[in-house]
C-alpha cells in the first residue's frame, strides 16, 4: 500500500467562477 498524494478538484467547467479563460456572457454548464 502506498500513500496517494492529495489531488485537486476536477478542472472547473465553463461558467464556474474558477473556470480557465474568460467567462462567457451566455450561460454554460457547471455543476
Amino acid at each position: 500500500w502506498q500513500h496517494q498524494p492529495d489531488s485537486g478538484p476536477p478542472a472547473a467547467a465553463p461558467g464556474h467562477p474558477l473556470a480557465p479563460g474568460p467567462h462567457p456572457a451566455a450561460p454554460s454548464s457547471w455543476g
Epitope: S7, G8, P9, P10, P17, P24, G31
Partner: antibody, heavy 120, light 107 residues
Framework: EVQLRQSGPVLVKPGASVKMSCKAS????????MNWMKQSHGKSLEWLAV????????AYNRKFKGRAILTVDKSSSTAYMELNSLTSEDSAVYYC?????????????WGTGTTVTVSS | DIQMTQSPSSLSASLGERVSLTCRSS??????LSWLQQKPDGTIKRLIY???TLDSGVPKRFSGSRSGSDYSLTISSLESEDFADYYC?????????FGGGTKLEIK
C-alpha cells in the same frame, strides 16, 4: 459523514476585520472547491468567493473583491475567510459550501454558518 | 449576472396539502438549477440539483420540474418538517445567483 464546521459568532466594530474558519471532515479537503456565501438578516443568499484548496486559486464576486481574502490550511483541512473594513452592511450569517466544479456535488454540503455582527 | 425571480415570497399551507414554488431565470440556465431548504436554526440542505434530481435521503414527496424559463419545486403532501425557507440557485453562469426565497408556513 461529510461536515463543514464553522467558527462561532463574532461581534466587531465598524472598520475592523474578521477572520472566520470552516473545518472540513469526512472527505478529501483538497478535492473540492470551497465557496463562501452571505445571508443578511431575513434576506436571500449571495455568493462571495471561491477557493481551490489544492493550489490556492481564488475567484471573487466583484462586489467583495479587495475586501474578502480566502485562504486554506491543508494540514488541518480548514478554509478561512477574512473580511476587512467592516460596516453594518456586513452584519450577516456567512456559510462555507463545497463544490466539485463540474459534477453533481455542486453546493451539496453547507457549513453551520458564522454570525457576524458589526456594531459600535 | 443572471437574475432569479422566486415566487411566492411566502406561503401558508396545511399539512397534507400540495404546494409549488417557482423560480424564473432572466437568461437560459439549461437546467442548471438547485433547490435548497433552510430550517429555522439556519441549517441549509440541498434538496434537488439539475432541476429535477433528488439528493440522496430527500423524501419522494419533493420533485422539481421546468417549463421554459420557469423552474418549480413541488411538495406533494406537506409534512411538519417541510415548513421552512426555500431558495432556488442557478449555477449555469458565474456568479452563481439565488432566488429571493419562499417562506413556507403552517396555516
Amino acid at each position: 459523514e461529510v461536515q463543514l464546521r464553522q467558527s462561532g459568532p463574532v461581534l466587531v466594530k465598524p472598520g475592523a476585520s474578521v477572520k472566520m474558519s470552516c473545518k472540513a471532515s469526512g472527505y478529501t479537503f483538497t478535492g473540492y472547491y470551497m465557496n463562501w456565501m452571505k445571508q443578511s438578516h431575513g434576506k436571500s443568499l449571495e455568493w462571495l468567493a471561491v477557493i481551490n484548496p489544492y493550489n490556492g486559486d481564488t475567484a471573487y464576486n466583484r462586489k467583495f473583491k479587495g475586501r474578502a481574502i480566502l485562504t486554506v490550511d491543508k494540514s488541518s483541512s480548514t478554509a478561512y475567510m477574512e473580511l476587512n473594513s467592516l460596516t453594518s452592511e456586513d452584519s450577516a450569517v456567512y456559510y462555507c459550501v463545497r463544490d466539485d466544479g463540474y459534477h453533481v456535488r455542486f453546493f451539496d454540503v453547507w457549513g453551520t454558518g458564522t454570525t457576524v455582527t458589526v456594531s459600535s | 449576472d443572471i437574475q432569479m425571480t422566486q415566487s411566492p415570497s411566502s406561503l401558508s399551507a396545511s399539512l397534507g396539502e400540495r404546494v409549488s414554488l417557482t423560480c424564473r431565470s432572466s437568461q437560459d440556465i439549461s437546467d442548471y438549477l438547485s433547490w435548497l431548504q433552510q430550517k429555522p436554526d439556519g441549517t441549509i440542505k440541498r434538496l434537488i440539483y439539475s432541476t429535477s434530481t433528488l439528493d440522496s435521503g430527500v423524501p419522494k414527496r419533493f420533485s422539481g420540474s421546468r417549463s421554459g424559463s420557469d423552474y418549480s419545486l413541488t411538495i406533494s403532501s406537506l409534512e411538519s418538517e417541510d415548513f421552512a425557507d426555500y431558495y432556488c440557485l442557478q449555477y449555469a453562469s458565474s456568479p452563481p445567483t439565488f432566488g429571493g426565497g419562499t417562506k413556507l408556513e403552517i396555516k
